[in-house]
């Protein structure tokens, strides 16, 4: 369906054309239940809550209402060359027995998440593949989406920015056909290879997918937990080699710096993930500059010269508010012969699942 927000002159400032599927987990008296439903064709723009943004104060937003009081909101923000859906939020009424039969609670729920929906200014965002936005207990999947904000006239621009999923990648297999209903579990982050070299050659080899789990207070004093995937295509890696400390520094999307520090126990000749440091920007947080660090971790351990490997997802708790979910990790620090992984030491999680 096509949704449009206009300014006082009648010129559109936001246009969006997409279909959406919702997957919602909720509680019933007989246990948890999952409902999937589509954005109905009679969904409408809430004109008095949608806005083109007021000069110097607020950003444009598109509020779509459907059913018995449910709303989907897309809140936009812009930079000099890019704009994005900074926040997607979904307000749903568990009292709607049509969508949520046997719900044990009748409350109004609000969930939200930052998104990967971004495009060049004066170009439309285009994504034929499903774009999934994961929120607490809810996944929204946009299909065949064309979205543009900060419009100059009441029509989509000629140029477009395609989503990652739509871009052909020579190194990856073709995408799997879309599943009938979106999964409420956040999709796994892409796995990428990282290496750090110094004067004596490679001191770190790592292959892993990274997901940040952040809990913070929003401007309206509510606390939210968000999962953010590190996108390898938008991440640059650097680092340093030392006799007692190896660092891997990841810069992602211009707003996130993630630092891994590997230490070595000389007496046992074992390396381990000793520290993680994060600096990122959370636009909707009460304090947008989010920082977390812990220098006394003991994770991803293996004998120097060997590699540590774990196919199971590993959760590394950094602080109360921040942990890193590491997927399909394979890492080796300090001593890397010939730029190749050495003998594998499997994690306990993998051994238990065999």
């Amino acid at each position: 369906a096509m949704f449009m927000v206009k300014n006082g002159n009648g010129t559109a400032c936001i246009m969006a054309n997409f279909s959406a599927a919702f997957s919602v987990n909720y509680d019933t008296k007989s246990g948890p239940k999952n409902m999937t439903f589509d954005l109905p064709s009679d969904a409408t723009v809430v004109l008095n809550r949608s806005s083109c943004g007021k000069e110097n104060t607020s950003d444009p937003s598109l509020v779509i209402a459907f059913g018995r009081g449910h709303t989907l909101t897309l809140q936009f923000t812009r930079q000099a060359t890019r704009y994005s859906v900074q926040l997607m939020s979904f307000v749903y009424q568990l009292s709607d027995t049509h969508l949520f039969p046997q719900a044990s609670s009748k409350e109004i729920k609000t969930v939200e998440s930052i998104t990967d929906i971004r495009a060049d200014i004066d170009k439309k965002y285009r994504c034929v593949s499903g774009t999934q936005v994961h929120m607490n207990q809810v996944t929204v999947t946009l299909h065949d989406a064309t979205i543009q904000a900060y419009l100059s006239q009441s029509s989509f621009s000629r140029g477009e920015t395609r989503c990652e999923q739509d871009r052909p990648s020579p190194t990856t297999a073709p995408p799997a056909p879309p599943s009938p209903s979106p999964s409420p579990v956040p999709k796994s982050p892409s796995v990428d290879k990282y290496n750090v070299s110094g004067t004596n050659g490679t001191c770190l080899l790592a292959s892993m997918g990274l997901q940040l789990n952040l809990t913070y207070e929003r401007k309206d004093n509510t606390t939210v937990t968000r999962l953010l995937n590190i996108n390898p295509n938008k991440t640059s890696a650097s680092g340093s080699c030392g006799a007692h400390l190896v660092t891997l520094e990841l810069h992602s999307e211009g707003t996130t710096v993630l630092l891994f520090q590997f230490g070595m126990n000389a007496s046992s000749s074992r390396f381990f993930l000793q520290g993680i440091q994060l600096n990122t920007i959370l636009p909707d947080a009460r304090d947008p500059a989010f920082k977390a660090a812990n220098g006394s971790l003991r994770a991803l351990q293996a004998t120097v010269g060997n590699s540590y490997k774990c196919n199971a997802e590993e959760h590394v708790r950094v602080t109360k508010a921040f942990s890193v979910n590491i997927f399909k990790v394979w890492v080796q620090a300090f001593k890397v012969e010939g730029g190749q992984f050495g003998s594998v030491e499997e994690c306990l999680l993998d051994e238990n699942s065999m």
Epitope: E55, N56, R78, Q79, A80, T81, D120, I121, D122, Y150, S152, Q153, S157, R158, G159
Partner: antibody
Framework: QVQLQQSGAELVKPGASVKMSCKAS????????IHWVKKSPGQGLEWIGA????????PYSQKFKDKATLTADKSSSTTYMQLSRLTSEDSAVYYC???????????WGQGTLVSVSA | DIQMTQSPPSLSASLGGKVTITCKAS??????MAWYQDKPGKGPRLLIH???TLQPGIPSRFSGSGSGRDYSFSISNLEPEDIATYYC????????FGGGTKLEIK
Amino acid sequence: QVQLQQSGAELVKPGASVKMSCKASGYIFTNYNIHWVKKSPGQGLEWIGAIYPGNGDAPYSQKFKDKATLTADKSSSTTYMQLSRLTSEDSAVYYCVRANWDVAFAYWGQGTLVSVSA
Amino acid sequence: DIQMTQSPPSLSASLGGKVTITCKASQDIDRYMAWYQDKPGKGPRLLIHDTSTLQPGIPSRFSGSGSGRDYSFSISNLEPEDIATYYCLQYDNLWTFGGGTKLEIK
């Protein structure tokens, strides 16, 4: 109508800095990027950088990122460009420019002449 | 940054004649190409945007075409007031001018 009024000519010594201004009128200042362009006999037209006054985001050309600093003051609808560590190579006319959405650089200021001389 | 290679750097033509200037981008710029006229003592003037769309008030003697990485700009039926330096500008990814072409009349 859209107008961009630039500050007057500057004569500066090598090694010094200069800050020029560009006052915008006739439109909502925070809705459009303001760009800065250098025009010199040797190099022709060169894009220096742009600033989005809404939040101060400012991408620069690789060549000018250590030379120019762009700022904006929303209250006065004015954009500023500071050039540092000036040399004779920086002698040029500097224009502030506004794009007309996706119609490239449609509106130009009258230019500020900077002369660097000992 | 995208690089723009403009040629020729200068050219001379007769009144009433036709000239063509080309610009090659270092990558596909999706037709986000503009052409400017620059005269001494004046600010540059936008002639064409989006590769081939003439700005209001610009005579149809000026034209542009191209796609991908290769673009061209032509002036037919040359007049004395066309003496100027002409620049291409890509605005697909940040902004980059070509090196300019100085047009003289024989």
